[in-house]
Amino acid sequence: SERCDDWGLDTMRQIQVFEDEPARIKCPLFEHFLKFNYSTAHSAGLTLIWYWTRQDRDLEEPINFRLPENRISKEKDVLWFRPTLLNDTGNYTCMLRNTTYCSKVAFPLEVVQKDSCFNSPMKLPVHKLYIEYGIQRITCPNVDGYFPSSVKPTITWYMGCYKIQNFNNVIPEGMNLSFLIALISNNGNYTCVVTYPENGRTFHLTRTLTVKVVGSPKNAVPPVIHSPNDHVVYEKEPGEELLIPCTVYFSFLMDSRNEVWWTIDGKKPDDITIDVTINESISHSRTEDETRTQILSIKKVTSEDLKRSYVCHARSAKGEVAKAAKVKQKVPAPRYTVELACGFGAT
């Protein structure tokens, strides 16, 4: 058939690889778009075809699998570069088809240059380590499938530009890097260089990740509302602006959703008729603890508004808390001639 299910350009899978290194790229069809795997497709008589569009070109062309030393090859649903070149950058398409069925997807591949300190435009994965939490490890990522288990590669770890050896609390252990006790000073970029032989040639795989030391779960507490509190009274006259900040501290918790909200007389501000605005800002500490501030603002407060209950609520995976603001109407200063004179028995 002429028709082909075209999944378009899958920009979610922006693949970046280093120049002059091996790269193995799986066809995304089987991972994200189709309900069957390559083996099933192959046994059903479907063929996987690869082609590409060079950077800044519109013309789709077949991939040349007849380059010297099989620089580009295909194995099952994997496209191999041994190694990549800078001008391999472009959009790659894998198409699965037979006479009655067709499905294809394209994805961008960017070949990236790095300097001698492993700096590059590569987007780095972030690995979070808990502060002072005992031994934690990071593993050299995305090296599976490059060499058989019978091959024993050499692995060298770097922090920034420096080879990791005789570091106080960081120990290389093959594919793993162990942090005996993670500290803020361990924040930074870590690179593993994996060197392995293949068919008389030596290849290098460079993998860099960012280590971020974050708050430990053993130190985590439920949200702490710093404001409103019992020490502050919002005393206003009708017509004045009422500004009440709700400031909440959240301990870092992996995958926790931190929420702050106001209620006025038990209702969300959206559900009442007062002209109220809420502005939020968020700041983070070095260990990714979070301080959220929501400022509730009523431009011209009425005497009715000053009788309402204003409660700040906060929630995280550690629990939920709430605190009411102390709001009251300012008592006008007495006018001497009338009020005080009456007090002295004047008539």
């Epitope: 509302i225 404001s227 020490h231 009440i244 900040p245 400031t247 501030t293």
Partner: antibody
Framework: QVQLVQSGAEVKKPGASVKVSCKAS????????MNWVRQAPGQGLEWVGQ????????YYAQKFQGRVTMTVDTSTSTVYMELSSLRSEDTAVYYC????????????????WGQGTLVTVSS | DIVLTQSPISLAVFLGQRATISCRAS??????????MHWYQQKAGQPPKLLIK???DLESGVPVRFSGSGSGTDFILNIHPVEVEDIATYYC??????????FGGGTKLEIK
């Protein structure tokens, strides 16, 4: 970044008043307590009082009660400290200092300080 | 009012050695899970700088040679190894229960 910039040095006569300002920037001004701390020449630090800009709520050290007034102008993110009935022992550098927020519900530290304002009381 | 007593009043140590400053409160400044005691460094002609908050938590950007410990009424600031730029006066500070903050009398650190 957080900055606290104070007004310049003042020379006052005994019995007069002085008003020192502290302009804040780099954070949400109304949400942090602002403290005033003074330091007489060659002496230690002495807490004068504090103000919460969102509400104007103030707390003063017992020693300064009745002589000190702290005010705020939220439109310019500035706090003021006025000390009246000055005497020679009020000669000191006066610092404004912001209270921090942390995982605990009180007992706050002073995380940012102004550069200080020297107030000299002399006849 | 809680009174904070710092000792010694002055301290001279060799470069690279340990300096230990102690601060005693007239009553406990600790509660469930934290102590409301902080340490500041003040160099000549400069405002104080927060070093350690809540007895032992190092403030952002402060070198790890500074450490704090203690709870209840007895607290310690350690500097190890002491460096030339650590010459300063060190103050303990408690903020137990708004609205009263007090400071210790200060400890002057010098290099031998």
């Amino acid at each position: 970044q957080v900055q606290l910039v104070q007004s310049g040095a003042e020379v006052k006569k005994p019995g007069a008043s002085v008003k020192v300002s502290c302009k804040a920037s780099g954070y949400i001004f109304i949400t942090y307590w602002m403290n005033w701390v003074r330091q007489a020449p060659g002496q230690g630090l002495e807490w004068v009082g504090q103000i919460f800009p969102a509400s104007g709520t103030t707390y003063y050290a017992q020693k300064f009660q009745g002589r000190v007034t702290m005010t705020v102008d939220t439109s310019t993110s500035t706090v003021y400290m006025e000390l009246s009935s000055l005497r020679s022992e009020d000669t000191a550098v006066y610092y404004c200092a912001r209270t921090d927020f942390y995982r605990y519900d009180g007992g706050y530290a002073l995380d940012y300080w102004g550069q200080g304002t020297l107030v000299t009381v002399s006849s | 009012d809680i009174v904070l007593t710092q000792s010694p009043i002055s301290l001279a140590v060799f470069l690279g050695q340990r300096a230990t400053i102690s601060c005693r409160a007239s009553q406990s400044v600790s509660t469930s899970g934290y102590s409301s005691m902080h340490w500041y460094q003040q160099k000549a002609g400069q405002p104080p700088k927060l070093l350690i908050k809540y007895a032992s938590d190092l403030e952002s950007g402060v070198p790890v040679r500074f450490s704090g410990s203690g709870s209840g009424t007895d607290f310690i600031l350690n500097i190890h190894p002491v460096e030339v730029e650590d010459i300063a006066t060190y103050y303990c500070h408690h903020s137990w229960g708004i609205p009263m903050y007090t400071f210790g009398g200060g400890t002057k650190l010098e290099i031998k």
